[in-house]
Amino acid sequence: GSERTCCPVNWVEHERSCYWFSRSGKAWADADNYCRLEDAHLVVVTSWEEQKFVQHHIGPVNTWMGLHDQNGPWKWVDGTDYETGFKNWRPEQPDDWYGHGLGGGEDCAHFTDDGRWNDDVCQRPYRWVCETELDKASQEPPLL
């Protein structure tokens, strides 16, 4: 398949990845679908350096990332290992809080106003960040 060698219009390149920052809010699943329709995924934070980059662009606004525990354990949407990977939770988070009164706990992770992470109700309409890697082969089947 073809490889993406430069970022699409309105995306920001950083360390061989492309990032797109929303200006509106969606529920986590709708944000995830939006990124996938762009052949991308919700942002996966793998280092303190990447955390700082994303934080700089989103500012002090609740923003979804590609991390959830809707099926049990915490998982990154691109398969990056959660247990051994970078984490930046707020103290005492994630807490799967049930006290919000919206039903269920909290299964989706977002950047908070100070950049650290919190788990929250996935239906909340937060902004989001899409990410796609440069030089990654597309999903198209090879030409025969």
Partner: antibody, heavy 123, light 107 residues
Framework: EVQLLESGGGLVQPGGSLRLSCAAS????????MSWVRQAPGKGLEWVSV????????YYADSVKGRFTISRDNSKNTLYLQMNSLRAEDTAVYYC????????????????WGQGTLVTVSS | DIQMTQSPSSVSASVGDRVTITCRAS??????LAWYQQKPGKAPKLLIY???SLQGGVPSRFSGSGSGTDFTISISSLQPEDFATYYC?????????FGPGTKVDIK
């Protein structure tokens, strides 16, 4: 000028299969998600499926999930819809439609449509 | 799934009339709504996206408004070529859903 031209419709028996094609021109095909939307005779519009520009992500309406498969060949600027286990209720005009892109965060709306191809499922 | 309803289902009007069609979503969709016009035997044509943004080439007599669950499309002065069926569509989440349509015909 953007153009979308569907083909492959026709009469098929219940349980049969059909493959629709949509030839695109006038835009960078691989940069846009593409969709199929259908319209039963005398009825309204029903979204069927969408595929991302690179082909890596697909979504389907519940009514066709497991029976229909959307795909694309960006080297040929062509969109496909493989329809299996067809039912009478699949009878419709099938439109190929291009995802609009406004720079906003709309998930999926359609700024260009083909003329449609009629699929009739009947014994 | 998000259900879309439209009212009225049909409206009879004369050239020069102002016509307003309402679309309602079963849950909030912000402003992720599009409107299409369809004439018999033809493909739909995009008129408005993001609830109020006019698609290029669409006459300024068409306008859209609304946010959340309630939306409208208005035609300020109906022209002969505007007699058609109008559909709303939510662009917020999958599955994408359309309203049942509103037919605008000649009084």
């Amino acid at each position: 000028e953007v153009q979308l031209l569907e083909s492959g419709g026709g009469l098929v028996q219940p349980g049969g299969s059909l493959r629709l094609s949509c030839a695109a021109s006038g835009f960078t095909f691989s940069s846009y998600a593409m969709s199929w939307v259908r319209q039963a005779p005398g009825k309204g519009l029903e979204w069927v499926s969408v595929i991302s520009g690179g082909g890596g992500s697909t979504y389907y309406a519940d009514s066709v999930k497991g029976r229909f498969t959307i795909s694309r060949d960006n080297s040929k600027n062509t969109l496909y819809l493989q329809m299996n286990s067809l039912r009478a209720e699949d009878t419709a005009v099938y439109y190929c439609a291009k995802r609009g892109y406004s720079g906003y965060e709309d998930l999926l709306y359609f700024d260009c449509w083909g003329q449609g191809t009629l699929v009739t499922v009947s014994s | 799934d998000i259900q879309m309803t439209q009212s009225p289902s049909s409206v009879s009007a004369s050239v020069g009339d102002r016509v307003t069609i309402t679309c309602r979503a079963s849950q909030g969709i912000s402003n992720w709504l599009a409107w299409y016009q369809q004439k018999p035997g033809k493909a739909p044509k995009l008129l408005i996206y993001t609830a109020s943004s006019l698609q290029g080439g669409v006459p300024s007599r068409f306008s859209g408004s609304g946010s959340g669950t309630d939306f409208t499309i208005s035609i300020s002065s109906l022209q002969p070529e505007d007699f058609a069926t109008y559909y709303c569509q939510q662009a917020n989440s999958f599955p994408i859903t359309f309203g049942p349509g509103t037919k605008v015909d000649i009084k």
